[in-house]
């Protein structure tokens, strides 16, 4: 999955009069990240995590930039001709992505009363619109307004593409990646194998993404590959994964063995439980 930054900017009109407020919701890698109105931006969650993202900076720049965008969108809404009585909304959704091969994509989408009527690929500058006559009318309306000052518009949308990517890179550089990662629950069990030996099994479950390192160590040193048996990494039905690794050891030497787990940059070690044998079964065929 690419890293992404998604801005959802909403302005409102009531009985044809454009309201002064606006709301921007920002998602980083698909997770709620920042919510801004015309007065301030607020991170989600606040606290230690937000401090990690920002360092010693504040959200002042974001607030200033998004306030400017809010004004632009209010002007756009004011130029939509078919405003009827009651409440109406204009949304601009802007998305930029950085893919694993470092290629980038940016797009912009306009919605009126929740209905998509105009999209632009911000790299190719290509516009697309749905086939409905209402969407076509709205799209022509907005495009004509945006073309009124063609140079400003061109500069504005180039800047939007560049700024979005620059912001995304800045947030990612902070080391706070919101891409979904769920650490595993790790559970070690022991079972009787044969006289004087026990099989110890280390199970990791509920983790995402699927890449994981799970292995047995003796006195802190990894056991050779052929003395361990691995289960496949399998989906568990909850959008996460599970796997296991087992090895056979001499009874009485349990305290020398630990299960080592590494996942998404985090690692942990898990001892063999002491005491009676818990499960009377063998993983070895």
């Amino acid at each position: 999955e690419p890293h992404s930054l998604r801005y959802n900017l909403t302005v409102l009109s009531w009985d044809g009069s454009v309201q002064s407020g606006f709301l921007t919701e920002v998602h980083l890698d698909g997770q709620p990240f920042l919510r801004c109105d015309r007065q301030k931006c607020r991170a989600k969650p606040q606290g230690q995590w937000a401090e990690d993202v920002l360092g010693n900076k504040t959200w002042d720049r974001e607030t200033r930039d998004l306030t400017g965008n809010g004004k632009d969108l209010r002007m756009t809404l004011a130029h939509i001709k078919d405003q009827k009585e009651g409440l109406h909304s204009l949304q601009e959704i802007r998305v930029c992505e950085i893919h694993e091969d470092n290629s980038t994509r940016s797009s912009q989408h306009f919605y009126y009363d929740g209905e998509l009527f105009l999209s632009q690929n911000l790299e190719t500058k290509e516009w697309t619109m749905p086939q409905s006559s209402r969407a076509q009318t709205l799209a022509m309306n907005v495009r004509n307004f945006l073309k009124e000052d063609a140079m400003k518009t061109k500069t504005h949308y180039h800047a939007m593409h560049a700024d979005c990517l620059q912001e995304l890179r800045r947030y990612l550089k902070s080391g706070v990646v919101l891409r979904r990662t769920v650490p595993p629950m790790v559970n070690v069990t022991r079972s009787e194998a044969s006289e004087g030996n026990i099989t110890v099994t280390c199970r990791a479950s509920g983790f995402y993404p699927w890449n994981i390192t799970l292995s047995w160590r003796q006195d802190g040193v990894s056991l050779s590959h052929d003395t361990q048996q691995w289960g496949d990494v399998l989906p568990d039905g909850n959008g996460t994964y599970q796997t296991w690794v087992a090895t056979r050891i001499c009874q009485g030497e349990e305290q020398r063995f630990t299960c080592y787990m590494e996942h998404s940059g985090n690692h942990s070690t898990h001892p063999v439980p002491s005491g009676k044998v818990l499960v009377l079964q063998s993983h070895w065929q």
Epitope: Q31, Q48, T181
Partner: antibody, heavy 124, light 107 residues
């Protein structure tokens, strides 16, 4: 559905450590859209937020300044629970302690699921 | 810390009455406010989030409004099960803070 089950002693001696555990079912302590909180309630202080733990690519904690020097909230992914430790307690820490989840709503930091509460008395 | 004050601190009402509680914040908190109901010996229960959004499963007789520093919580027609204490809570800034509560009892 999501449930929180609290456990821990109801009586703690002054200067000792208050320890409570909150077991989660129906959700994961390492969900990266939730935060796991401790809140207490007493007649003198009302409802008082103490702190939280949450996972966003790594583990974070936020604590109320009033208890920051004495509090630790730890997640335990192997048992899917989280714990509260409050050191050097005084009778002023006598309260009903609640664990609570925050995170069902995309933007609102609302405590939508609560534990049953544990009355903790600090007395010798 | 952001202070929240509630008024009244208690009120007596009858079944069917319209009940209004206000919550005042010590600074602008936009719409970052929730309302809870608590019955004796029980944990608080979320009723309203983001100042005006009804939590799933909560009856529509409960409503909330306001933004900035002034907020209102309303029960349009009080039912026997609504006699309880109601709290507002802000999440604009850490630490999360709660109002002192408003106790609604039977007249």
């Amino acid at each position: 559905q999501v449930q929180l089950q609290q456990s821990g002693p109801g009586l703690v001696k002054p200067s000792q450590t208050l320890s409570l555990t909150c077991a989660i079912s129906g959700d994961s302590v390492s969900s990266n859209s939730a935060a796991w909180n401790w809140i207490r309630q007493s007649p003198s202080r009302g409802l008082e937020w103490l702190g939280r733990t949450y996972y966003r690519s790594k583990w974070y904690n936020d604590y109320a300044v009033s208890v920051k020097s004495r509090i630790t909230i730890n997640p335990d992914t192997s048992t899917n629970q989280f714990s509260l430790q409050l050191n050097s307690v005084t009778p002023d820490d006598t309260a009903v302690y609640y664990c609570a989840r925050e995170g069902a709503h995309e933007w609102a930091d609302a405590f939508d699921i609560w534990g049953q509460g544990t009355m903790v008395t600090v007395s010798s | 810390d952001i202070q929240l004050t509630q008024s009244p601190s208690s009120l007596s009402a009858s079944v069917g009455d319209r009940v209004t509680i206000t919550c005042q914040a010590s600074q602008d908190i936009s719409n970052y406010l929730n309302w809870y109901q608590q019955k004796p010996g029980k944990a608080p229960k979320l009723l309203i989030y983001d100042a005006s959004n009804l939590e799933t499963g909560v009856p529509p007789r409960f409503s909330g409004s306001g933004s900035g520093t002034a907020f209102t919580f309303t029960i349009s027609s009080l039912q026997p099960e609504d006699f309880a204490t109601y709290y507002c809570q802000q999440y604009d800034n850490l630490p999360h803070t709660f109002g002192p509560g408003t106790k609604v009892d039977i007249k």
